[in-house]
Interface confidence: low
């Protein structure tokens, strides 16, 4: 898979695994998914600390990480076409496993608005700094990578696996080794909590094969929300050690008998559970009977309890669990209402932002405002939207209709605009003539000039303007600049071979510079001639040519 599990931390009802390996975000999510999990969520400071802890484990074992900055995918992504929402903590991103927008965030820097491509979030670790638990990894957003190009600075990813519950680690009362195998295919000999459905292999003894005993246990749900191994009494007990080894494996007190045997006991206010090892409080709230964020409140004399819900929640029919109150039923918002755990929030439709009179009001976003226009040239704000337009000589282009691209008037749908040669420029074009002909004052036609063996004439220089005269040459050829590798115009004109009619006098020298009949050719300037507008990499100089114009507006830009 290209990724190795290096570390695992289990806490609460979830396990986090950290993996090294250069994978795209999609490949990393697939890897987590294969074992029943997702890329990790970081929905609170506490969860950020769990994730940091598993990364700390990984980084301590990962000798190959030499980069100063390291990145690890988490399950926070924003789909293509979904724009940034600066008013939300997650900025319009969402968790891959679903779920509400969460209040915690830890962005590395201000996010740039880009709706064009999918964006993914990674945790950014500065490996030059000690990984203090107080300094939580920052969130960095960027491209999601692809199988061929996962992102050179992505070092790995973090998965999260959620469970109904956890078992306590098995307690050994004597020498031995426990190996846990989790449902997500990780083996470990030290887990603070062991997920439901994990297997535990216990090998007792100090390594001598003859003395080794093996036990096998499964973490099962013994009763609703009660998980244990089904073992009774400490494991691997030895009269040689009594209570001296790991407190006999007892949770609280260990009592030795005279014969080397021992029993586990509990302190006042606690009782011994069925495993004969673990102690639980006699306080009815200590077993955490209340769920879903409900608080357990002791009744008089500590005999019974009631569950109490936080604001925005109410008790369900079981009187143990809190369920969210749907405040959106009262329509408190002007446009969209999103019910959230314990509350609600008002959202505005795309193209609107919070503002205006009253709670939850929305006002139009002026996308064309100074400094925020998404358009390359013209921008027109509309109610809830905007559209881009382009100056004369340009058309709308780009994936989202916000860019402007030069119109090549020399290959326009209406046919050649010039009588002879045509030079495309950014936003415009110029006409030129074949050798021996000069541009007429109208900037389009060519008139007979003094005989010359030079290259095709470009637009007239400033001092030549309006001085050419003679009979006009019939419309014979169009020439447009060839394009460089990045689409930049080269000024060398291209042309089709002109029809050699009797009234189109073309000398033999330029004919040698034309391509074979029917195929486009490139004018190449003989080196002995002075540079004209048609030479070198620069664009033709501006003459008095008439400009074919095209007005391009009315195409909606993407929000």
């Amino acid at each position: 898979t290209g990724a190795d599990t290096e570390a695992v931390v289990c806490v609460g009802t979830a396990c986090y695994t950290a993996h090294s390996g250069k994978l795209s975000a999609a490949e990393a999510q697939n890897h987590c998914n294969q074992n029943g999990g997702n890329l990790a969520t970081v929905k609170s400071k506490e969860e950020a600390q769990h994730v940091q802890r598993v990364l700390a484990q990984l980084l301590r074992r990962e000798a190959a990480l030499t980069a100063r900055m390291s990145k690890f995918w988490i399950g926070l992504q924003r789909e293509k076409g979904k724009c940034l929402d600066p008013s939300l903590p997650l900025k319009g991103f969402s968790w891959v496993g679903g779920g509400e927008d969460t209040p915690y965030s830890n962005w590395h820097k201000e996010l740039r608005n880009s709706c064009i491509s999918k964006r993914c979030v990674s945790l950014l670790l500065d490996l030059s700094q000690p990984l203090l638990p107080s300094r939580l990894p920052k969130w960095s957003e960027g491209p999601c990578g692809s199988p061929g190009s996962p992102g050179s600075n992505i070092e790995g990813f973090v998965c999260k696996f959620s469970f109904k519950g956890m078992c306590r680690p098995l307690a050994l009362g004597g020498p031995g080794q426990v190996t846990y195998t989790t449902p997500f295919q990780t083996t470990s000999s030290s887990l603070e909590a062991v997920p439901f459905a994990s297997a535990a292999n216990v090998a007792c003894g100090e390594g001598d094969k003859d003395e080794t005993q093996s036990h096998y246990f499964l973490c099962k749900e013994k009763a609703p929300d009660v998980f244990d191994w089904g073992s009774s009494g400490p494991l691997c007990v030895s009269p040689k050690y009594g209570c001296n080894f790991n407190n006999g494996g007892c949770h609280q007190d260990c009592f030795e008998g005279g014969d080397g045997s021992f029993l586990c006991g509990c302190r006042p206010g606690f009782r011994l559970l069925d495993d004969l090892v673990t102690c639980a409080s006699r306080n009815p709230c200590s077993s955490s009977p209340c769920r879903g964020g409900a608080t357990c409140v002791l009744g008089p004399h500590g005999k019974n309890y009631t569950c109490r819900c936080p604001q925005g929640y109410q008790l369900d029919s079981s009187q143990l669990d809190c369920v969210d109150v749907d405040e959106c039923q009262d329509s408190p918002c002007a446009q969209e209402c999103v019910n959230t755990p314990g509350g609600f929030r008002c959202e505005c439709w795309v193209g609107y932002e919070p503002g205006g009179p009253g709670e939850g009001a929305c006002q139009d976003v002026d996308e064309c405002a100074l400094g925020r226009s998404p358009c390359a040239q013209g921008c027109t704000n509309t109610d809830g939207s905007f559209h881009c337009s382009c100056e004369e000589g340009y058309v709308l282009a780009g994936e989202d209709g916000t860019q402007c691209q030069d119109v090549d008037e020399c290959v326009g749908p209406g046919g050649p605009l010039c009588d002879s040669l045509c030079f495309n420029t950014q936003g415009s074009f110029h006409c030129g003539c074949l050798p021996g002909w000069v541009l007429a004052p109208n900037g389009v036609s060519c008139t007979m000039g003094p005989v010359s063996l030079g290259p095709p004439s470009g637009p007239p220089d400033e001092e030549d303007k309006g001085e050419k005269e003679g009979s006009t040459v019939p419309r014979a050829a169009t020439a447009s600049p060839t394009r460089g590798p990045e689409g930049t115009p080269k000024a060398t004109p291209t042309t089709s071979r002109p029809s050699l009619s009797s009234d189109a006098p073309i000398t033999s020298a330029p004919l040698k510079m034309l391509a074979p009949s029917g195929s486009p050719g490139v004018w190449r300037e003989p080196s002995i001639h002075h540079a004209t507008a048609a030479s070198g990499p620069q664009e033709p100089a501006g003459g008095d040519s008439s400009v074919a114009t095209q007005n391009n507006d009315g195409t909606d830009g993407q929000k």
Epitope: E46, R53, Q57, P130, L132, P133, S134, R135, S190, E192
Partner: antibody
Framework: QVQLVQSGAEVRKPGASVKVSCKAS????????MHWVRQAPGQGLEWVGE????????YYNQKFKGRVTITADKSTSTAYMELSSLRSEDTDVYYC?????????????WGQGTTVTVSS | DIVMTQSPDSLAVSLGERATINCKAS??????????LNWYQQKPGQPPKLLIY???NLESGVPDRFSGSGSGTDFTLTISSLQAEDVAVYYC?????????FGGGTKVEIK
């Protein structure tokens, strides 16, 4: 109640090593970091290093790196600090102290201290 | 390393009077809105005892005549009404960066 009990005073010659122990009780040993701090007679406090007993991850003050080794034995809930290549300026009281796992690692419980004397 | 500088080195205050100790860090010890600064009290022959954590939080069991304030680089420990049992050396400590460092200590005596 929560307590940290340290081993007794030690006397060593320059160049030798010393290993001080700190036995924890009254709390889950693997749920807190264990730190070592030293204090020269009549002087201030100096952080030596720390260990996460659940996985034996250690961080050291660079000043001591290479000379100090901090270990932990989960089965006996005991942390150890070994200092090698002793010099006379290592004559100090060495304290173990626990800290919370996350966030601000303040030292809420301290051992009684172990005096280490380095003398020829 | 972050250097912690305490002032004054020693302080003599009458019983029932206010005592103020300052601690200055060579760089900010704040992170994500919290100040990673703690105060300890040490009496002769005893280990240090935590008084205040995160600049202003009183450790449980510590009398409320002790209080802490400050952020960034400048912090203060105040004993509002000095008692005889408060005679000790007081240390500030930063836990924002490795190595964790302590101030040089301030000795508080009764005038």
């Amino acid at each position: 109640q929560v307590q940290l009990v340290q081993s007794g005073a030690e006397v060593r010659k320059p160049g030798a090593s010393v290993k001080v122990s700190c036995k924890a009780s009254g709390y889950t040993f693997t749920s807190y970091w264990m730190h070592w701090v030293r204090q020269a007679p009549g002087q201030g406090l100096e952080w030596v290093g720390e260990i996460d007993p659940s996985a034996s991850y250690t961080y050291y003050n660079q000043k001591f790196k290479g000379r100090v080794t901090i270990t932990a034995d989960k089965s006996t809930s005991t942390a150890y600090m070994e200092l090698s290549s002793l010099r006379s300026e290592d004559t100090d009281v060495y304290y173990c102290a626990r800290s919370v796992y996350y966030g601000n690692k303040y030292f809420d419980v301290w051992g009684q201290g172990t005096t280490v004397t380095v003398s020829s | 390393d972050i250097v912690m500088t305490q002032s004054p080195d020693s302080l003599a205050v009458s019983l029932g009077e206010r005592a103020t100790i300052n601690c200055k860090a060579s760089q900010s010890v704040d992170y994500a809105g919290d100040s990673y600064l703690n105060w300890y009290q040490q009496k002769p022959g005893q280990p240090p005892k935590l008084l205040i954590y995160a600049a202003s939080n009183l450790e449980s069991g510590v009398p409320d005549r002790f209080s802490g304030s400050g952020s960034g680089t400048d912090f203060t420990l105040t004993i509002s009404s000095l008692q005889a049992e408060d005679v000790a050396v007081y240390y500030c400590q930063q836990t924002n960066e490795d190595p964790r460092t302590f101030g040089g200590g301030t000795k508080v005596e009764i005038k």
